[in-house]
Interface confidence: low
């Protein structure tokens, strides 16, 4: 905390308009406390939450908020279905603005935003939208929180039946029901750019009182993808006057902001008022301290399917403040190469950044399917031996993944390594979110719009006259799911391996919760058909005796192409592009940026938000992903992996699941669950095409030369 | 009325520590966040640092090692160390007020510096 | 670093009405406050957070504020008025704090 002057965060953004005098006609609600004498209350101090009630009665009452939420002891209400969204896709008027209020910053709301279901009592309107942070670097900041796990930044919507109200304040002031959402926001590597208008104005109301209208945004784009899986109960204000009329709405999923954007929050400034005069200081733990549940039953969502991969991917390994902690950056440098027909090699190197040092070993895993089966092996690698590992009695018939996992001291954990598929005979090529087998041309009117081309200058090697093929996959799992030691054949997905369609002694499918944890979205695939990964020997035929070696020439291709890549947030929430912002644009290659312009421009056959991941359908178990829950059920269970002990060789049996998977919806902004389409005639891939890699996530840096194609991806 | 003083200006030596005390009559240091500001002579004003009713303090990055402001419910005193020709100056205590200003301001005492 | 600018010097006729400017990249986040000092004597708070006048202030000075300027008008400028005005704001991150004056504007009234 701090008090002070007339000094304040200095922020270098471009000019943000302030409000005019003769403009602020809306500003009522939030100036009605110095108009009509309201209590002064604050978030510490002789003002504090524990003395609201002296100034403010229903402050002590027995159902107020904020609660934590305990999944668990929740129930499913099936009167808690869908939420019904009007006006949340448009963008908002320039007469929308934001105002510090010196407790929180809030946005006025000037358009038409409506929400009904959710077993509200009517059609709410949108008033305004509140946050609350913490103090720093990610602390908790959240009001409300979920088995104990509290977000950084909370961002509240309230809603008042305009039906009934004139006006959201006249609500409050009789003592009638008001609607409220909760929506976490969660440390991610990447700006979100949908919240790119709400950081500006931050940057504009950085001292108490100031206003500031907002550059458009898409009030949709603040809330998560999957809105199907959220919380009800019936609470509070968690401000005075606390009236116990909030309905309350909290997601379940969160929503990514990065470090540079939280930096914003942390910069706004109050007033504080001590005795009879007030001192400036940063407005920071802006949250009420959480309040007894008493009486209360808090209700879970029975949108169908909404909680499938709830549990696994979100509670156990949380994305909250205090979630698993990761050592170190992957290990980097993913390679396999053959020693023989029967034995390969892995090679990595350390990873770049070693948070807590120091690495003890390496933990490699890796999976392999035959005969309907998946078998799983982990085992051990010091660290101050050649970072390799050879797999002996390899079948050329089955389909094996690797990844590796620095280990630290008390069990700390790296993320883990980029997922490499290897299989010989067959190429499978990982995009978006299918699998691909190379060279079988089949007709789909829209999956050029998923798939890119590969280039004919891909190259098959072979060894012992066994041809092999490989592919690197985006897994890239963060912190979020590093710390659950999750086997490699829990981690590929269903749809990964439905998408190859193998027969006879392949694999169907594999189970929903099976790797990779996060596939490239949408937004990604649309960048990737402007880098078609161009698959060379060299990359990996020789990786040479130095697994340490710098990349190869390939390698530092792709690593500077990668920069395009919006890559998804830890909290797997969402791939976020910033196209005409991102400054690391100036540093791509001309072919990459050609291509990106090809992407820009290109027809779309089937258009998706850039927000939105090509893997929001509700079915499909990609732990961390923002998943939309329209789609239609199938018959996945929600399997979750077993834990590792890396220390151990294990071997565990995952069986199969067959899976369909369908298009259903029709909404381009949001498309559903991805289809298992075939390839259309117009996705030609060579013959030969042996070995691609495709990007990696957001801190792999590996990879394979990036350049430009005809094709395009939305 | 309320109005401030500075104590403890005087001429010194370089590399010279020397401490600047500051009293306030007609209200309580204790509420307010108190700033020290400097002027060389014939130049403009230039914040030092600020330090918050809760004791935490904020300086300019020049000031930052040298200089440290700090705190009874009586006085606010600021240490410099090391000082150089350069610090000569007219040192004010300022009370912080209306949210966003320096609304009150000592007479000012002057520190010279000089071998 | 952060800099507010201000001009070195200003004239205005007794009587006149003058205007002081103050600029600077990004103040239009942050409030501006404006200080009159008196040779030989401590600086005294005209304007704070762009346009409040603390008690005492006589309401020929007055504050605005548009887009990155920060602006001090005195009307019916008095001989009584010739002095150094400084504005300040601030520069800074959530980790950094710093106070910013401006150079100041010296104010002659002639005539």
């Known amino acids: 905390v701090l008090h002070y002057v007339v000094c304040f965060p200095a922020l270098t953004e471009g000019y943000v308009g302030t409000l005019q005098e003769s403009r602020q006609d809306s500003s009522v609600q939030i100036r009605r406390r110095k108009a009509s004498g309201d209590p002064y209350w604050a978030y510490s101090g002789a003002y504090g939450p524990e003395h609201w009630v002296t100034s403010s009665v229903s402050c002590g009452g027995s159902h107020q908020s904020p609660i934590d939420i305990l999944d668990h002891h929740a129930r499913v209400g099936d009167e808690y279905q869908e939420l019904q969204l009007d006006g949340f896709d448009n963008e908002s008027s320039n007469k929308t603005w934001m105002k510090n209020t010196g407790k929180t910053v809030a946005i006025l709301l000037k358009d038409d935003y409506f929400v009904s279901g959710a077993g509200l009592p009517g059609r709410f309107k949108a008033e305004k939208v509140e946050f609350h942070w913490g103090h720093s670097n990610g602390s908790a900041g959240s009001e409300h929180s979920v088995n104990g796990r509290r977000f950084p930044v909370e961002m509240q919507i309230f809603f008042y039946n305009p039906d009934d109200f004139d006006s959201f304040q006249t609500a409050i002031s009789e003592n009638r029901i008001i609607g409220a959402m909760a929506i976490f926001f969660q440390v991610s590597p990447r700006d979100n750019s949908a919240l790119d208008p709400i950081i500006h104005g931050l940057k504009g109301v950085v001292h108490h009182e100031k206003e500031t209208f907002l550059d458009p945004f898409i009030l949709r784009d603040l809330l998560p993808a999957s809105l199907g899986s959220y919380y009800r109960y019936t609470g509070s204000l968690t401000t005075p006057p606390c009236s116990e009329i909030v309905e309350w709405i909290v997601f379940r999923r969160p929503v990514p902001i990065s470090y540079h954007q939280l930096e914003a929050f942390y910069s706004i400034f109050t007033t504080e008022q001590q005795d009879h005069v007030k001192s400036v200081e940063y407005l920071r733990n802006n949250f009420r301290p959480q309040q007894a549940l008493n009486d209360r039953v808090v209700s879970k969502s029975a949108v169908r399917d909404a909680w499938n991969h709830d549990l696994a991917d979100f509670l156990d390994n949380p994305l909250g403040t205090e979630a698993s902690k990761v050592c170190s950056s992957p290990p980097i440098h993913m390679k396999v190469q053959p020693l023989n027909q029967t034995a390969l090699q892995v090679s990595w190197s350390q990873p770049e950044t070693i948070y807590h040092p120091p690495i003890m070993n390496y933990m490699i895993s890796y999976s392999w399917t035959k005969n309907e089966d998946e078998k799983e092996k982990t085992f051990t690698k010091d660290s101050d031996k050649d970072l390799k590992a050879t797999i002996s009695h390899v079948s050329p018939d089955s389909l094996y993944l690797f990844r590796v996992q620095a280990v630290c001291r008390n069990d700390m954990r790296s993320d883990f390594s980029q997922t490499m598929l290897f299989q010989a005979n067959t190429t499978r090529i990982f995009q978006g979110t299918r699998i691909v087998k190379t060279g079988v041309p089949t007709a789909s009117p829209a999956s050029s719009a998923d798939m890119a081309p590969i280039s004919s200058g891909s190259s098959t090697w072979t060894s012992s006259g066994i041809p092999f093929s490989f592919v690197s996959m985006a897994t890239g799992m963060g912190p979020s799911s590093s710390g659950s030691q999750a086997t490699v054949a829990s981690v590929v997905t269903s749809t990964l391996l439905a998408g190859l369609g193998f027969g006879g002694g392949g694999i169907s499918s594999f189970p929903s919760t099976v790797w990779p944890t996060r596939l490239p979205t949408a937004s990604a695939a649309s960048k990737q058909a402007g880098r078609t990964v161009l698959a060379t020997t060299e990359a990996l035929a020789s990786p040479g005796p130095d697994v340490h070696s710098a990349p190869s020439k390939d390698s530092e291709g792709t690593e500077e192409g990668e920069k395009e890549e919006k890559s998804e947030s830890e909290d797997g929430e969402r791939e976020h592009e910033e196209e005409e912002k991102d400054s690391e644009k100036k540093e791509k290659s001309e072919a990459t940026h050609t291509a990106a312009e090809s992407d820009r421009t290109a027809p779309a056959p089937t258009p998706s938000s850039p927000h939105r991941t090509a893997a929001e359908g509700g079915h499909q178990t990609i732990p961390g992903r923002r998943q939309d829950h329209s789609a239609p059920a199938t018959d996945q269970p929600g399997h979750v992996a077993p834990d590792l002990d890396p220390l151990v060789d294990t071997a565990t049996q995952v069986p199969p699941t067959a899976t369909e998977e369908h298009y259903s919806g029709s909404d381009p902004r949001r498309p559903e669950m991805p289809s298992k389409k075939p390839m259309s005639r117009g996705d030609r891939f060579s013959e030969d095409s042996k070995f691609i890699t495709v990007n990696p996530a957001e801190k792999n840096t590996s990879g394979m030369l990036s350049r430009p194609s005809p094709g395009r991806m939305e | 009325a309320q109005s401030l003083e500075e104590f403890g200006g005087r001429l010194a030596t370089p590399g010279t520590p020397l401490t600047l005390t500051c009293t306030a009559s007609?209200?309580?240091?204790?509420?307010?966040?108190m700033s020290w500001v400097r002027q060389a002579p014939g130049k403009g004003l230039e914040w030092i640092g600020t330090i918050g009713g809760r004791g935490d303090a904020y300086y300019a990055s020049w000031a930052k090692g040298r200089f440290t402001i700090s705190r009874t419910s009586t006085t606010v005193d600021l240490k410099m160390t090391s000082l150089a020709t350069e610090d000569t100056a007219t040192y004010f205590c300022?009370?912080?007020?209306?949210?966003?200003?320096?609304?009150?301001w000592g007479p000012g005492t002057l520190v010279t510096i000089s071998s | 670093s952060f800099v507010l600018t201000q001009p070195a010097s200003v004239q205005v006729n007794l009587g006149q009405t003058v205007s002081l400017t103050c600029t600077a990249d990004?103040?239009?986040?942050?409030?501006a406050s404006w200080y009159q000092q008196k040779p030989g004597q401590a600086p005294v708070l005209l304007i704070y957070?762009?346009?409040s006048r603390p008690s005492g202030v006589p309401d020929r000075f007055s504050g605005s504020s548009s887009g990155n300027t920060a602006t001090l008008t005195i009307s019916g400028a008095q001989a009584g008025d010739e002095a150094d005005y400084y504005c300040?704001?601030?520069?800074?991150?959530?980790?950094?704090?710093?106070?910013?004056f401006g150079g100041g504007t010296q104010l002659t009234v002639t005539g």
């Open positions: 957070r762009d346009t």
């Open positions: 007609g209200f309580s240091l204790g509420t307010y966040s």
């Open positions: 990004t103040l239009s986040r942050r409030y």
């Open positions: 300040a704001t601030s520069d800074g991150s959530g980790s950094s704090y710093q106070c910013v």
């Open positions: 300022v009370r912080e007020n209306y949210g966003y200003a320096f609304d009150i």
